[in-house]
């Protein structure tokens, strides 16, 4: 960066080369040049010679005043007019940033995704800061009351295997940066409390010729968990509305949930699913579109098709469970 | 050799506008500043607007006095500077002068067009 | 904006005399100073830049020197010629700013 020229002289910024958006800034340079009494000293950021708010101070320093700076970053260099010189003598640089302190960290989830063998710690950041912030996550064994500390940019994946005091945690997050430092409430966790389990995938659909025809959907997941209950929701691509379809779930075998849906209609299936009385459900699954037939043969849609999307109907399935409306959107 | 040609002046009445034109030639006009600068009948020069070199931005300036009122704008695929004057008063009465700067003082200076607010 | 004092206002001088204009300015201004000529209808003409420096093909008994606030416009031997309207400007600090003119007339 700017800050590796070699310089023949000094440059400083303040309050400080990283500050709040929106300060007023001062930026400082003085020439140290072999045999010349600057006749002028000139600010460039990011290339662009600066115009307005020069002052010289002294026969070797100038200031360059900014009112409310709001650039995330810049750089920053000073270059003096020297007699008998032709071109500008390059006195320093230096890269100057600006941003927010850390909001309190909120929202701190933990999951463990199954068969991943981590866990996975994610929190609201809050605002942009634009400058580097750094996050230490503490996770505490409420049972030996030992501590760990993981430093990462964003969110972080423990390994279950590294969580060898007992099954009840503590976790709070910290966020810290040159403008300040926050903590998190704290979070407390059983880890058999917090497992999604392994996505559960829409394989394929199929319309079936009857007296009403009927769309069956194909879906699976390969979870261990026993006890799982899952949500579908489907919408005609037209339609805003989502419907939703609840239901207990045994993976042991593929399942199949009936539809009674409109002739010649393009749809759009998600689905869902969580280890029944727990916390967290697993995110909506792929879009999996399927278009009924206009009347009597046979249609089948395969998985992973990617298509526009955007509404709904009435439903049956084999599956038990109950049909409701919803407008949520993804939940965690 | 540096030549500015200065056009647009006249006589106006106060609240009315004109357009100043200055066209330049015999030197790199992107790399210089292009003002105007102004001399009231019998008066001292006063520097009204300049618009910038290309290391600059282009960046703009304004006496107080034409703050709002007037833009200086350039064309630098024409060689021309110009300066809309809207809302003119008595006081805006003047020669108006173009005048070239690399480093800030002015090296090169138009004729001159005589700008007349009366009603 | 840095503030330029001219002195005098006017003078009255004769062809062979020495002819001094001063300029002061309201805060050092390191040298960033020149000097132009006006003659009655006519466009300002460059003396004297950077203090002392002496633009191409400006005659020779024309000089200025000067340094922090205090700066001298110097005619060796006034010509007929130089009879005219000079002004300082400087241009250390933006806006560059005029000094008030100070006019040259045959005694």
């Known amino acids: 960066g700017i800050t590796n020229i070699n310089c023949s002289g000094h440059i400083w910024v303040e309050p400080a080369t990283i500050f709040k958006m929106g300060m007023n800034i001062s930026i400082y340079c003085q020439a140290a040049i072999k045999n010349c009494q600057p006749r002028k000293l000139h600010f460039y950021k990011n290339g662009i010679k600066e115009r307005f708010q020069i002052t010289r101070i002294n026969k070797t320093t100038a200031r360059l005043w900014y009112k409310n700076f709001l650039e995330p970053h810049a750089s920053m260099y000073c270059t003096a007019e020297c007699p008998k010189h032709f071109q500008e003598t390059l006195i320093c640089g230096k890269d100057i940033s600006s941003g927010y302190p850390p909001d309190i960290p909120d929202e701190v989830t933990c999951v463990i995704y199954e068969y991943s063998g981590n866990m996975t710690c994610t929190w609201n950041a809050g605002k942009l800061t634009y400058i580097d912030t750094k996050y230490v996550v503490h996770v505490k064994s409420l049972e030996t009351e030992e501590e760990q500390q993981y430093l990462t940019s964003s969110y972080i994946n423990i390994s279950t295997d590294s969580l060898q005091g007992g099954k009840k945690y503590l976790v709070w997050v910290q966020a810290a940066n040159a403008l300040g430092m926050e903590e998190s409430k704290q979070l407390q966790i059983h880890l058999d409390d917090i497992v999604i389990p392994s996505a559960a995938v829409i394989s394929r659909a199929e319309t079936i010729n009857a007296t009403v025809p009927k769309t069956i959907i194909y879906w699976d997941s390969q979870t261990t968990i026993e006890k799982v209950s899952c949500e579908m929701r489907y919408k005609a691509t037209t339609n805003q509305t989502w419907n939703v379809k609840e239901f207990d779930t045994n993976f042991t075998y593929v399942q199949q949930s009936e539809f009674y849906l409109e002739p010649n209609i393009k749809y759009v299936f998600q689905v869902r699913c969580q280890e029944t009385g727990k916390r967290y459900w697993q995110p909506w699954s792929s879009l999996f579109f399927h278009k009924t037939p206009e009347t009597v043969p046979q249609v089948t849609s395969k998985a992973f098709q990617h298509d526009t999307w955007n509404s709904g109907l009435t439903v049956a399935s084999i599956s038990t469970g109950h049909l409701t409306s919803d407008n949520r959107g993804d939940i965690g | 050799q540096v030549q500015l040609v200065e056009s647009g002046g006249g006589v106006v009445q106060p609240g009315r506008s004109l357009r100043l034109s200055c066209a330049a030639s015999g030197f790199d006009f992107n790399s210089y500043g292009m003002s105007w600068v102004r001399q009231a009948p019998g008066k001292g020069l006063d520097l009204v607007a300049d618009?910038?070199?290309?290391?600059?931005?282009?960046?703009?300036y304004y006496a107080d006095s034409v703050k709002d009122r007037f833009t200086i704008s350039r064309d630098n695929s024409k060689n021309t500077l110009y300066l809309q004057m809207n809302s003119l008063r008595a006081e805006d009465t003047a020669v108006y002068y173009c005048?070239?700067?690399?480093?800030?003082?002015?090296?090169?200076w138009g004729q001159g067009t005589l700008v007349t607010v009366s009603s | 904006d840095i503030q330029m004092t001219q002195s005098p206002s006017s003078l009255s001088a004769s062809v062979g005399d020495r002819v001094t204009i001063t300029c002061r300015a309201s805060q050092d201004i390191y040298t960033n100073l020149a000097w132009y000529q006006q003659k009655p209808g006519k466009a300002p003409k460059l003396l004297i830049y950077?203090?002392?420096s002496l633009q191409d093909g400006v005659p020779s008994r024309f000089s200025g020197s000067g340094s922090g606030t205090d700066y001298t416009l110097t005619i060796s031997s006034l010509q007929p010629e130089d009879f005219a309207t000079y002004y300082c400007l400087q241009d250390s600090e933006y806006p560059p700013t005029f000094g008030q003119g100070t006019k040259v007339e045959i005694k």
């Open positions: 618009i910038n070199s290309k290391s600059y931005n282009y960046a703009t």
């Open positions: 950077h203090a002392s």
């Open positions: 005048a070239v700067h690399h480093s800030d003082y002015f090296e090169y």
